[in-house]
Amino acid sequence: MAVTACQGLGFVVSLIGIAGIIAATCMDQWSTQDLYNNPVTAVFNYQGLWRSCVRESSGFTECRGYFTLLGLPAMLQAVRALMIVGIVLGAIGLLVSIFALKCIRIGSMEDSAKANMTLTSGIMFIVSGLCAIAGVSVFANMLVTNFWMSTANMYTGMGGMVQTVQTRYTFGAALFVGWVAGGLTLIGGVMMCIACRGLAPEETNYKAVSYHASGHSVAYKPGGFKASTGFGSNTKNKKIYDGGARTEDEVQSYPSKHDYV
């Protein structure tokens, strides 16, 4: 039950996180005009990864896309790439995790297969979250650098009369959305990995020892008292549902959780 809850919660948290990463990537307010210690302008500038916008005090907003690819700063391209990679990995992770959910039955999919898929999606969510956090942080660092550079030569003019006030940009809402969303995706991924440990079959380094009694066979497993009796069709690799113990053949057929650590 706890495993299902952890897996379900991990999925939901990751889903919210990835939705946030997509929202942040599409948002126009990655950087916004710094209004502190600046003359009050009737024009407000803000920029996103894909376009820059100007909102006039009249209420009119004009946005212009960055229609060049080569002319854009390498850092901006890198941020775009990180966010897209984050979205793609997250989307694939979501797709995989849907099939991995314990509460969803798909044919005769084994728990160990679901464990593998849960771990895979968890890792994808972790990488997706890290990509988003890295992308947002690179952009934030770029803003901080530019902010202090523009502050250093903010007022330029001749004869003491101020001619130009340079527009400075500060953190926009998208950065905070991106950080939170990346964090949520990361947490969701960790929860999926934790859930995977619960889903994966318990295995020790010892081989199961079979003792043959007259009339039927019982496979004893170290560390627990659950067994599969060998009457009739039960002698085949049949799953026991209480506690996740497996017959000897079944245990050997699938990788253990230690293969992924």
Epitope: A42, S52, E56, S57, S58
Partner: antibody
């Protein structure tokens, strides 16, 4: 057709108060930033107050700050200018105007005259 | 506050003549975000409110004859009337639409010779 009609002007003593009104029609008033502009007897133009469309921002020059208050009632399509502690230099024709592209004042009323004199 | 300086204060012209008037601002009105200059030109005839002619320093308002042309960038701006007509006799004001408070120039009065 866009129409802006000012009212409320008149003769007032120094230190007195007056409330100007502007009735708007023919455009989406609630989505428009609005301004009050005055023209002195010497024909100089001065923006005295601006209010954003969402009612979130108001701007005043230092000459009227603390004395004038701009407000709007989107339900009534009306703009107001509450003037207090009036001085002789506030004597002017007060125009109500709408802000358009480039923050330019694209539509103006005919104006209402305010005279501050003892 | 931004100071808007218009020159000359008055111009005496003959019909059909080309006229230019200047407007200088104490700070640049160029917005780096959209590369537009937030300078506006108005025309005011006696007994009437000002009428919008040009915004963004060079964009003509709809219905304004194409003999009116706005130019300039940063701090220096010009309004040109290619061929003055009798109905153009008025006072022309420039306005800073970038910084609050939105300030006006003192005006250039266009008179007929």
């Amino acid at each position: 057709e866009v129409m802006l009609v000012e009212s409320g002007g008149g003769l007032v003593k120094p230190g007195g108060s007056l409330k100007l009104s502007c009735a708007a029609s023919g455009f989406s008033f609630s989505n428009s930033a609005m301004s009050w502009v005055r023209q002195t007897p010497e024909k100089r133009l001065e923006g005295v107050a601006t209010i954003s469309s969402g009612d979130s921002y108001t701007y005043y020059p230092d000459s009227v700050k603390g004395r004038f208050t701009i407000s709007r009632d989107n339900a009534k399509n009306s703009l107001y200018l509450q003037m207090s502690s009036l001085r002789s230099e506030d004597t002017a024709v007060y125009y109500c105007a709408r802000q358009g592209y480039g923050n330019a004042l694209d539509y103006w009323g005919q104006g209402t005259s305010v005279t501050v004199s003892s | 506050d931004i100071v808007m300086t218009q020159s000359p204060s008055s111009l005496t012209v003959t019909a059909g003549e080309k006229v230019t008037m200047s407007c200088k601002s104490s700070q640049s009105l160029l917005n780096s975000g959209n590369q537009k200059n937030y300078l506006t030109w108005y025309q005011q005839k006696p007994g009437q409110p000002p009428k919008l002619l040009i915004y963004w320093s060079s964009t003509r308002e709809s219905g304004v004859p194409d003999r009116f042309t706005g130019s300039g960038s940063g701090t220096d701006f010009t309004l040109t009337i290619s061929s003055v007509q009798a109905e153009d006799l008025a006072v022309y004001y420039c306005q800073n639409d970038y910084y609050y408070p939105l300030t006006f120039g003192a005006g250039t009065k266009l008179e007929l010779k």
